[in-house]
């Protein structure tokens, strides 16, 4: 249920030095400053709970302002092994090594961690995103080239006294940011080793991590404005449901996406939106300050609770699933992209979901906690919510069992 028990060591509830250590925006990812090597080389690193490699640009690239120069580090050790990571679209490849790594606005520790030095990539780095690498915070099972490559967080916990837990508060701006605003803006917080109570309101509710590879969870029910989608709950988790800070959208399996869009369309039918809007192709715009948030429904995902037959729900607003976009051609209006999209790899609870909540990745207790984020965008009528408990039977049946042969496919 809720986390009201006495706090463990390392969970003192105040991590001032780590608050506001993230920058960026949902469309291009949130990044933290890290240093690599001796003397330290500073890089901005994308925080990605949907992968498990620490990988950094290590060669010139048109989209990179800086990159990791291994030859300048006296503590770099070459593992004499390559790594190749293909995605459905694009890829990166590089050379494995280890070096000393620290997080300036994180715990006051330095660890020797595996680093993939990216020497070649396609469709990986994003022009103008301001990050030069990726910090995969998921489990070793999905690390490349194989699960013997220890992920960064595992190394951190093993080599230090940092508790095996981190939490993320991603703060969507609620309005589009230009490049200089992103550089100056606060994007949120990654609290390493604990929970900061100032970053959320209400109670934390926990859902079990079903399996330690991605941060896999089980969705047991979906509602649009309180109306049950009434699908077999297996569909919601086909072929898995994961929490992924490296994905922008809320991505839903095809059948679920179609049912959700049908329901959202019906709820917002006072306006006629183009088909391209629901596909994420067309923007919709309103005169500045007149966005009719009230015509769009709230979306609730019910997650398996920690207690048998008990679930809780997280509810997001249109302020989370309509993503503000700046377009010079329509700059006098407030324009938005529909940030729910179709997936062939299961449900992905990306930044659209995470921006509503403070999310605790409690690896030690194999669970993920959700509480209403202190920085989520809302209006005077509705707010994001985390509520429970609800009685839900046969929740175990909602999980999909992936055939053994498919388990090595890479989520993108």
């Amino acid at each position: 249920e809720t986390d009201e028990e006495p706090e463990e060591p390392g969970r003192r509830g105040s991590f001032v030095e780590m608050v506001d250590n993230l920058r960026g925006k949902s469309g291009q990812g949130y990044y933290v400053e890290m240093t690599v090597g001796s003397p330290p080389q500073t890089l901005n690193i994308l925080v990605d709970t949907g992968s498990s490699n620490f990988a950094v640009g290590a060669a010139p690239h048109p989209f990179l302002h800086r990159y990791y120069q291994r030859q300048l580090s006296s503590t770099y050790r070459d593992l004499r092994k390559g790594v190749y990571v293909p995605y459905t679209q694009g890829k990166w490849e590089g050379e494995l090594g280890t070096d000393l790594v620290s997080i300036p606005h994180g715990p006051n520790v330095t660890v020797r961690a595996n680093i993939a030095a990216i020497t070649e990539s396609d469709k990986f780095f994003i022009n103008g995103s301001n990050w030069e690498g990726i910090l995969g915070l998921a489990y070793a099972e999905i690390a490349r080239p194989d699960d013997s490559l220890e992920p960064f967080f595992d190394s951190l916990v093993k080599q230090t006294h940092v508790p095996n837990l981190f939490s993320l508060q991603l703060c969507g701006a609620g309005f589009p940011l230009n490049q200089s605003e992103v550089l100056a803006s606060v994007g949120g917080s990654m609290i390493i080793g604990g929970i900061d109570h100032s970053l959320y309101t209400g109670s934390l509710w926990y859902t079990p991590i079903r399996r330690e590879w991605y941060y896999e969870v089980i969705i047991v029910r979906v509602e649009i404005n309180g109306q049950d989608l009434k699908m077999d709950c297996k569909e919601y988790n086909y072929d898995k449901s994961i929490v992924d800070s490296g994905t922008t959208n809320l991505r839903l399996p095809k059948k679920v996406f179609e049912a959700a869009v049908k329901s959202i369309k019906a709820a917002s039918s006072t306006e006629k939106f183009p088909d391209g809007f629901w596909l994420g192709e067309q923007l919709v715009c309103w005169q500045a300050g007149t966005t009719p948030w009230n015509i769009f429904p709230v979306i609730s995902l019910y997650l398996m609770g920690e207690v048998t037959n008990q679930s809780f729900r997280i509810t997001i607003l249109p302020q989370q699933y309509l993503r503000p976009v700046e377009d010079v051609a329509t700059s006098q209006d407030d324009c938005y992209k529909f940030a729910i999209s179709q997936s062939s790899t299961g449900t992905v609870m990306g930044a659209v979901i995470m921006e509503g909540f403070y999310v605790v990745f409690d690896r030690a207790r194999k669970r993920i906690g959700f509480a209403v984020s202190a920085c989520h965008v809302h209006d005077e009528f509705r707010t994001a919510a985390v509520e429970g408990p609800f009685v839900t039977l046969d929740m175990e049946d909602c999980g999909y069992n992936i055939p053994q042969t498919d388990e090595s496919t890479l989520m993108t």
């Epitope: 103008g128 006629k272 939106f273 183009p274 088909d275 192709e281 923007l283 715009c285 377009d327 051609a329």
Partner: antibody, heavy 116, light 107 residues
Framework: EVQLQQSGAELVRPGTSVKLSCKAS?????SYWIHWVKQRPGQGLEW???????????KYNQKFKDKATLTVDTSSSTTYMHLSSLTSEDSAVYYC?????????WGQRTLVTVSA | DIQMTQSQKFMSTSIGDRVSVTCKAS??????VAWYQQKPGQSPKSLIY???HWYSGVPDRFTGSGSGTDFTLTISNVQSEDLAEYFC?????????FGGGTKLEIK
């Protein structure tokens, strides 16, 4: 400033194919879909199809699904349209355009002439 | 497919006049209509979106109106640089379709 730079005019033989390009600049390339539009003299504008540069998802006008193939190279922020089995009916001006609300930005045009 | 019909292929006007170009959709497209201006040898230029909203930098003598199936582009105080062909487009559903165009000429 958003710009869509199209490749130059093409004179091609019937039965052959041609690949037109559209290089985007001035915005985050993967954030907006790219469309292709055909214009023949006296026949107005026809939408061919579109591509999402973030994942190469395509959607075509049924009329052009066996004629046009759209691809993308994000490393160069370039979209391509391959036209196959060319006939005189394919002689036209072709435009790429960027999505947003409708098509706020257009490329400068590529003239394709199919002639023996 | 949705047909967009611009019944007048040509319209004559005088400098300083007010002129209205019409466009009819074969089915309800809400306000998901855009207008473009095209001069000979040039690419289309975006004027109006969502039936009545100006794209940035478009002079306010161009106004769009309508919803459902009937749409109008009005140019008040016509200038010589406005002499061009005007196209409507529906972007309500795929495939996107354009009107056949209306050429604005000087009397």
């Amino acid at each position: 400033e958003v710009q869509l730079q199209q490749s130059g005019a093409e004179l091609v033989r019937p039965g052959t194919s041609v690949k037109l390009s559209c290089k985007a600049s001035g915005y985050t390339f993967t954030s907006y879909w790219i469309h292709w539009v055909k214009q023949r003299p006296g026949q107005g504008l026809e939408w061919i199809g579109m591509i999402d540069p973030s994942d190469s998802y395509t959607k075509y006008n049924q009329k052009f699904k066996d004629k046009a193939t759209l691809t993308v190279d994000t490393s160069s922020s370039t979209t391509y349209m391959h036209l196959s089995s060319l006939t005189s009916e394919d002689s036209a001006v072709y435009y790429c355009a960027r999505s947003g609300v409708a098509f706020p930005y257009w490329g400068q045009r590529t003239l394709v002439t199919v002639s023996a | 497919d949705i047909q967009m019909t611009q019944s007048q292929k040509f319209m004559s006007t005088s400098i300083g006049d007010r002129v209205s170009v019409t466009c009819k959709a074969s089915q309800n497209v809400g306000t998901n209509v855009a207008w473009y201006q095209q001069k000979p040898g040039q690419s289309p230029k975006s004027l109006i979106y969502s039936a009545s909203h100006w794209y940035s930098g478009v002079p306010d003598r161009f106004t769009g109106s309508g919803s459902g199936t009937d749409f109008t582009l009005t140019i008040s105080n016509v200038q010589s640089e406005d002499l061009a062909e005007y196209f409507c487009q529906q972007y309500n559903s795929y495939p996107y379709t354009f009107g056949g165009g209306t050429k604005l000429e000087i009397k």
